[in-house]
Interface confidence: medium
Amino acid sequence: PEPPTACREKQYLINSQCCSLCQPGQKLVSDCTEFTETECLPCGESEFLDTWNRETHCHQHKYCDPNLGLRVQQKGTSETDTICTCEEGWHCTSEACESCVLHRSCSPGFGVKQIATGVSDTICEPCPVGFFSNVSSAFEKCHPWTSCETKDLVVQQAGTNKTDVVCGPQDRLRA
């Protein structure tokens, strides 16, 4: 019979013959012959292959380097790579999460609208009228101005987006 020019799914062509690919989690040891099946071996402890393949070497699991702020989100298997994420307080610099940076701080006059996650940075917002922030923080929201009235005091100094109001005693000398 004519040697095949194409093979079925999960097969590959070698030496004019169709051999079975190795399943995910296994690597190729030797191609099939007329008389023998493809020989495959499981990947080692810290290795993986995630497709039907004819690779002679498995891929190393990704290393989540703690010096780059990374930690393991999902441990790799023989068929899947390790997934890294950032430690709390840090977020990934890229979709591949190869390293982490510290969450951005919001400057005085701005508060945190949304605390950063492992994949997105802090979202800051200007403190609106009636609110202030006098800190540089990646976590603190804008705080409302103190209500002098509820303390039976009066406003002695108006608040800004960076400072609270200053309350003082009522002026007793009222005409």
Partner: nanobody, 121 residues
Framework: EVQLLESGGGLVQPGGSLRLSCAAS????????MQWVRQAPGRGLEWVST????????YYTDSVKGRFTTSRDNSKNTLYLQMNSLRAEDTAVYYC??????????????WGQGTLVTVSS
């Protein structure tokens, strides 16, 4: 000039406790998030904990969660790290750092001299 002075380190047995302090001066302490980082012998820097300016929010690296507690007293310009159930792997020089506006890891803008914690029997 910004100054951070850590203290409270020492030799402690596994399972023991220590309380580290960091006295801050030269900047408005209450106006900044702060953090603890550590460096074990022959290792890179490792972030340990962050505390927000008001002390409301705290974050910890996985290996110390439930064992370490970070707090601050803004009236005393002091940052604390309460370390319980200490393990040999906690042995390191501990530094407090001011959380700057933006930096990459391992590039902290203000440093103290650190305080050495040794956990050994």
């Amino acid at each position: 000039e910004v100054q951070l002075l850590e203290s409270g380190g020492g030799l402690v047995q596994p399972g023991g406790s220590l309380r580290l302090s960091c006295a801050a001066s030269g900047f408005t302490f209450s106006g900044y998030d702060m953090q603890w980082v550590r460096q074990a012998p022959g290792r890179g820097l490792e972030w340990v904990s962050t505390i927000s300016a008001s002390g409301v929010y705290t974050y910890y690296t996985d290996s110390v969660k439930g064992r370490f507690t970070t707090s601050r007293d803004n009236s005393k310009n002091t940052l604390y790290l309460q370390m319980n159930s200490l393990r040999a792997e906690d042995t390191a020089v501990y530094y407090c750092t001011k959380y700057p506006n933006r930096f990459a890891r391992n590039n902290f803008d203000y440093w103290g001299q650190g305080t050495l914690v040794t956990v050994s029997s």
